[in-house]
């Protein structure tokens, strides 16, 4: 029987042959394609129900997308010797509904992890920190991609999904080195307080296409390295002075605010003044009012204080649930 990718193969990816012998250190697992030259293993759309045990030690980029993994147990990638080179792990769209504590332990070089498009009914608080110590060893993760991981309503456990995700992000302060965090399309209504304060190295934060209704309790003050903040397609109605001041105080940030249902009443005056002065907001000329009805589609930058009055109550269509 042939080993699919021992030494350098002429074809970039070779499907493995089934082998009756014990796996060799650099053998390609069944149902996978391997390239030692590219340090890449792809086990894509093969309906795998567990992580292959016989991954080659050279693997730097591992694609396990489009499978049926269901549960990622503790030590799912722990091997002897360890997969010391593994730097990028993509598990998107693999029908994961449970990621247990320590699932990514013993991956000392793991820089990028993509769990997107998995309906995570359970994400352990210790999924990324590996232990329940109040301060854990720092995770090597630099990029964490968690887009569309919200489970369907009937699969949600009796707890806040926002809280579950936040607990995993802050546990043991393990993700202090994280540069990129994508949390788009998760139906988040809020961010638990202080979660961002524990991710001080963030440069890119994507919270787009959620249902965030307010940023009043979200502090960006510690995110001095933040370069991109994506808040498009949420349910934001106004940004208040505290938030405006914090965003203005970030030296490198670009903020994206398109497609939010801005309420253009007297409480919008400070935000409009700020928008006219700031260079922080990308595409600020595209921001328009959604409420009240008389202001619908008016461009925020074109409003003045006389336009922004307060009616006693707003229409029911403003409600978010």
């Amino acid at each position: 029987t042939s080993s699919a990718s021992s030494s350098s193969s002429s074809a970039p990816f070779l499907a493995s042959a089934a082998s009756a012998q014990p796996p060799l250190p650099d053998q390609c697992p069944a149902l996978c394609e391997c390239s030692e030259a590219a340090r890449t293993v792809k086990c894509v759309n093969r309906n795998l129900t567990e992580v292959p045990t016989d991954l080659p030690l050279y693997v730097r980029n591992l694609f396990l997308t489009g499978n049926q993994l269901a549960v990622l147990p503790a030590g799912a990638f722990a091997r002897r010797p360890p997969l010391a080179e593994l730097a990028a792990l993509n598990l998107s769209g693999s029908r994961l509904d449970e990621v247990r504590g320590g699932a990514f332990e013993h991956l000392p070089s793991l820089r990028q992890l993509d769990l997107s498009h998995n309906p995570l009914a359970y994400l352990s608080p210790f999924a990324f920190s590996g232990s329940n110590a109040s301060i854990s060893a720092p995770s090597p993760l630099v990029e964490l991609i968690l887009n569309h991981i919200v489970p369907p309503d009937d699969k949600r456990q009796n707890r806040s999904f926002e809280g579950m995700v936040a607990a995993a992000l802050v546990a043991g302060r393990a993700l202090q080195g994280l540069h990129l965090l994508e949390l788009a399309s998760n139906h988040f209504l809020y961010l638990p307080r202080d979660v961002l304060a524990q991710l001080p190295s963030l440069r890119y934060l994507d919270l787009s296409n959620n249902s965030l209704v307010s940023l009043t309790y979200v502090s960006f003050r510690n995110l001095t390295h933040l370069e991109s903040l994506h808040l498009e397609d949420n349910a934001l109605k106004v940004l208040h002075n505290g938030t405006l001041a914090e965003l203005q105080g970030l030296p490198h940030v670009r903020v994206f605010l398109d497609n939010n249902p801005w309420v253009c009443d007297c409480h919008m005056a400070d935000m409009v003044t700020w928008l006219k002065q700031t260079g922080v907001v990308q595409g600020k000329d595209r921001l328009t009012c959604a409420f009240p009805e008389k202001m619908r589609n008016r461009v925020l930058l074109e409003l003045n204080s006389a336009d922004l009055d307060c009616d006693p109550i707003l229409p029911p269509s403003l409600q978010t649930s």
């Epitope: 926002e162 209504l189 307080r193 209704v213 409480h267 978010t320």
Partner: antibody, heavy 118, light 107 residues
Framework: QVQLQQSGPEVVNPGASVKISCKAS????????MNWVKQSRGKSLEWIGD????????NYNQKFKDKATLTVDKSSNTAYMELRSLTSENSAVYYC???????????WGQGTSVTVSS | NIVMTQTPKFLLVSAGDRVTITCKAS??????VAWYQQKPGQSPKLLIY???NRYIGVPDRFTGSGYGTDFTFTISTVQAEDLAVYFC?????????FGGGTRLEMK
């Protein structure tokens, strides 16, 4: 499941102090602010203040600033509120309550009755 | 301090009734309003947060609406187990303040 277990009822003399405890279980204690709320007999609720168990930072209602001190012990997942210089006005049920959605309190202790009486 | 004026103080209801409670803030609290239920001898229980979002496990007969200063809490079809005191709370500005409560009693 999340539980907040408060200490038992207290009967104290005017001028004395009392320290109420609130032991949290079923969640990561340091991830959520803990609030304290007063309810006098047959009355509404009054927010006393909150504490961030992660760093001990506090935010008080000015009305209670000189009356209450909030602390936490992370090692035992316990929050405390000390009330000092007690008068009959301080007779009430005191609740600890975990913050869930920012500002809102999603789990409450069973309450601790404090009676100030000579 | 922001004052939350809750009306009415008492409501006499029959099973199946639709009930509406209002809360008016002395200044705008945006959408930072929560509603709680407290049954006799029990601790309060969170029902609604951010004006209109039901907390986990809360039946859909409980709804909230409003924005700015005027807020409404509705029980679409009252059931016997809904007899309790209901409180609004603003969590926009410290100190967080509660309404005076509305007691639901059976006719």
């Amino acid at each position: 499941q999340v539980q907040l277990q408060q200490s038992g009822p207290e009967v104290v003399n005017p001028g004395a102090s009392v320290k109420i405890s609130c032991k949290a279980s079923g969640y990561t204690f340091t991830d959520y602010y803990m609030n304290w709320v007063k309810q006098s007999r047959g009355k509404s609720l009054e927010w006393i203040g909150d504490i961030n168990p992660n760093n001990g930072g506090t935010n008080y209602n000015q009305k209670f600033k000189d009356k209450a001190t909030l602390t936490v012990d992370k090692s035992s997942n316990t929050a405390y509120m000390e009330l000092r210089s007690l008068t009959s006005e301080n007779s009430a049920v005191y609740y600890c309550a975990k913050e869930g959605p920012p500002g809102a309190m999603d789990y409450w202790g069973q309450g601790t009755s404090v009676t100030v009486s000579s | 301090n922001i004052v939350m004026t809750q009306t009415p103080k008492f409501l006499l209801v029959s099973a199946g009734d639709r009930v509406t409670i209002t809360c008016k803030a002395s200044q705008s609290v945006s959408n930072h309003v929560a509603w709680y239920q407290q049954k006799p001898g029990q601790s309060p229980k969170l029902l609604i947060y951010y004006v209109s979002n039901r907390y986990i496990g809360v039946p859909d007969r409980f709804t909230g609406s409003g924005y700015g200063t005027d807020f409404t809490f509705t029980i679409s079809t009252v059931q016997a187990e809904d007899l309790a005191v209901y409180f609004c709370q603003q969590v926009y500005s410290s100190p967080f303040t509660f309404g005076g409560g509305t007691r639901l009693e059976m006719k």
